[in-house]
Interface confidence: low
């Protein structure tokens, strides 16, 4: 329904905190290099000509999109083409122009200092003295380095924070009660950011098919007794959200999300059994919780998928009728039978059933042709169960930090030409699977590992895709979404890639490696071992681990060292000559 | 190497009350999320409760809920849940679980398990 001023209508529909707070947000995704101060003031421009608007809806320019009115109030910033460079040239455009080029220059990787955390007491200092600043300090920093963070979720979130220092600001032993729940958003937040990553370069890249594919499998698998219209409808609003989300109009998708949850609530009984507790929490907690609930049971007796999909002799008559709801009911009873299949596996099987139709039903006896067709699921379904357990083996063996590095070494001589920074970044994040999924029953490995695996292979694919260098990298990100991983999977050594230089200040190491967090030291262990294996691609598992003792031995003894830094210069030449001749190089 | 230790199992009649703790070693114990879980016999693992690692967040089972509490003391490493107005259809394996994450999903999301405490609800 249309609305006089569509600014009003939001900021009415949102109340003034969820507007300040989403405008604060989209401005700092858009504009990630621009001063705090500065998009403060933006947004109380902003806020306060809403407020005129709702007072008067007739009002001058309370008519224009909100496109329209956040664009020209970005484009008055001074320092634009300066700070910005040719992002600048999106403000000669006219909407919707501008604002897809705005989109286009979102920065998944700005060059951006990383956050250091202060002491507790001058956090809640900071807190006590102006905590409105103080949160919304928090949603500008963790919106400029995730430029395609859930919105309505980093509401969530700060909500969150919030709750953390008016506990533990007043509590006996502040940084006890305080980093853990600290850590605990961080952590939650980064995987937070990473899953919402996805389902944007899912709409972007692949279109809105290809998202309303993977969101049919997985509220099918989640809501397993819901009707196919049910799932059908949720799907239609949760694709409108991201959409919105993705395509920074944060305003309409917080409003639209909080729409839906009210839907799912008041219609739980006709979609999950798992809903009520949900449904009693306030809205940024309800709408959390029913994204992260669990899955539904599955109905008893549901009938074998053969007879409608491969025995029936209408298959092709129905499939001509309507192609897209043929196969959306046929990916709903797919994956309502199957919470122990990845959604990305669900995808692959519903892509080799839409194949098969194709060729099929234009064959001269089409049931024929399409009779075998459940057989053709048996390898698809068995690579990723094979991978896991052979990972998972690996994992159990070898511990969560050199199973990264065994993944390390292996995507490193996969693709060695990306930035080193990323093939850590990507490879410690891969490791994490062991951990996160290995431990559970064989029924629940593959919807954790290999959905996992996704989120992460699109955080390579976002950082690749800013500055490409590896055509097998392009190839695997571009090709198919569902197939990313077993095209990673499938690429063998880069016979083409011509080794690195040996640089010998890549390996000199200095003192300030002793203060470093165990998490650190491990990064630059790591960072040194991609590099060996940049020098010496075809160097073998056992030489790689003898360099990587060696200088583990070489870091403890210069740490335990009287005099640090003058160890560290003359133990490291030794390191590198032995590392050089244990290596051939 | 990661253990979660329960203790505090036991018998007890219908309508009274046990307290369960997990003892963790080998990882950081702030750092996980803890849940507890059970399984009667020839039944299903369920979820029962969950609690955030800070502790500011907890889930309960429908089934548990005004009767069981979770708390955890991250000084001592330790999670406990106290069982009141206990029903013979408590009677299962309770198990202790962390998880990375905060976990308001699946038990696939949980990293690390104990072996399990019997708790038997029977007059």
């Known amino acids: 329904d249309a609305h006089k001023s569509e600014v009003a209508h939001r900021f009415k529909d949102l109340g003034e905190e969820n507007f300040k707070a989403l405008v604060l947000i989209a401005f700092a995704q858009y504009l990630q290099q621009c001063p705090f101060e500065d998009h403060v003031k933006l947004v109380n421009e902003v806020t306060e000509f809403a407020k005129t608007c709702v007072a008067d809806e007739s009002a001058e320019n309370c008519d224009k999109s909100l496109h329209t009115l956040f664009g020209d109030k970005l484009c008055t910033v001074a320092t634009l083409r300066e700070t910005y460079g040719e992002m600048a040239d999106c403000c000669a455009k006219q909407e919707p122009e501008r604002n897809e080029c705005f989109l286009q220059h979102k920065d998944d990787n700005p060059n951006l200092p990383r956050l250091v955390r202060p002491e507790v007491d001058v956090m809640c200092t900071a807190f006590h003295d102006n905590e409105e600043t103080f949160l919304k300090k928090y949603l500008y920093e963790i919106a400029r380095r995730h430029p395609y963070f859930y919105a309505p979720e980093l509401l969530f979130f700060a909500k969150r924070y919030k709750a953390a220092f008016t506990e533990c600001c007043q509590a006996a032993d502040k940084a006890a009660c305080l980093l853990p729940k600290l850590d605990e958003l961080r952590d939650e937040g980064k995987a937070s950011s990473a899953k919402q990553r996805l389902k944007c370069a899912s709409l972007q890249k692949f279109g809105e098919r290809a998202f309303k594919a993977w969101a049919v499998a997985r509220l099918s698998q989640r809501f397993p007794k819901a009707e196919f219209a049910e799932v059908s409808k949720l799907v239609t609003d949760l694709t409108k959200v991201h959409t919105e989300c993705c395509h920074g109009d944060l305003l309409e998708c917080a409003d639209d999300r909080a729409d839906l949850a009210k839907y799912i609530c008041e219609n739980q009984d006709s979609i999950s059994s798992k809903l009520k507790e949900c449904c009693e929490k306030p809205l940024l907690e309800k709408s959390h919780c029913i994204a992260e609930v669990e899955n539904d049971e599955m109905p008893a007796d549901l009938p074998s998928l053969a007879a409608d999909f491969v025995e029936s002799k209408d298959v092709c008559k129905n499939y001509a009728e309507a192609k897209d709801v043929f196969l959306g009911m046929f990916l709903y009873e797919y994956a309502r039978r199957h919470p122990d299949y990845s959604v990305v596996l669900l995808l692959r099987l519903a892509k080799t059933y839409e194949t098969t139709l194709e060729k099929c039903c234009a064959a001269a006896d089409p049931h024929e042709c399409y009779a075998k067709v459940f057989d053709e699921f048996k390898p698809l379904v068995e690579e990723p169960q094979n991978l896991i357990k052979q990972n998972c083996e690996l994992f159990e063996q070898l511990g969560e930090y050199k199973f990264q590095n065994a993944l390390l070494v292996r995507y490193t001589k996969k693709v060695p030409q990306v930035s080193t920074p990323t093939l850590v970044e990507v490879s410690r994040n891969l490791g994490k699977v062991g951990s996160k999924c290995c431990k559970h029953p064989e029924a629940k490995r593959m919807p954790c590992a290999e959905d996992y695996l996704s989120v992460v292979l699109n955080q390579l694919c976002v950082l690749h895709e800013k500055t490409p260098v590896s055509d097998r990298v392009t190839k695997c990100c571009t090709e198919s979404l569902v197939n990313r991983r077993p095209c990673f999977s499938a690429l063998e050594v880069d016979e083409t890639y011509v080794p690195k230089e040996f640089n010998a200040e890549t390996f000199t190491f200095h003192a300030d490696i002793c203060t470093l967090s165990e998490k650190e030291r491990q990064i630059k262990k790591q960072t040194a071992l991609v590099e060996l294996v940049k020098h010496k691609p075809k160097a073998t598992k056992e030489q790689l681990k003898a360099v990587m003792d060696d200088f583990a031995a070489f870091v403890e003894k210069c740490c335990k060292a009287d005099d640090k830094e003058t160890c560290f210069a003359e133990e490291g030449k030794k390191l590198v000559a032995a590392s050089q001749a244990a290596l051939g190089l | 190497e990661v253990q979660l230790v329960e203790s505090g199992g036991g018998v007890v009649q219908p309508g009274g009350s046990l307290r369960l703790s997990c003892a963790a070693s080998g990882l950081t114990f702030s750092s996980y999320a803890m849940g507890w879980f059970r399984q009667a016999p020839g039944k299903e693992r369920e979820r029962v409760v969950s609690?955030?690692?800070?502790?500011?967040?907890?889930y309960y089972a429908d089934s548990v809920k005004g009767r069981f509490t979770i708390s955890r003391d991250n000084s001592e490493n330790t999670v406990y849940l106290q069982m009141n107005s206990l029903r013979p259809e408590d009677t299962a394996t309770y198990y202790c679980?962390?998880?990375?994450?905060?976990?308001?999903?699946?038990?696939?999301?949980?990293?690390?398990w104990g072996q399990g405490t019997l708790v038997t609800v029977s007059s």
């Open positions: 679980a962390a998880a990375r994450y905060w976990a308001t999903g699946s038990e696939y999301e949980f990293d690390y």
């Open positions: 609690i955030s690692r800070g502790g500011g967040y907890t």
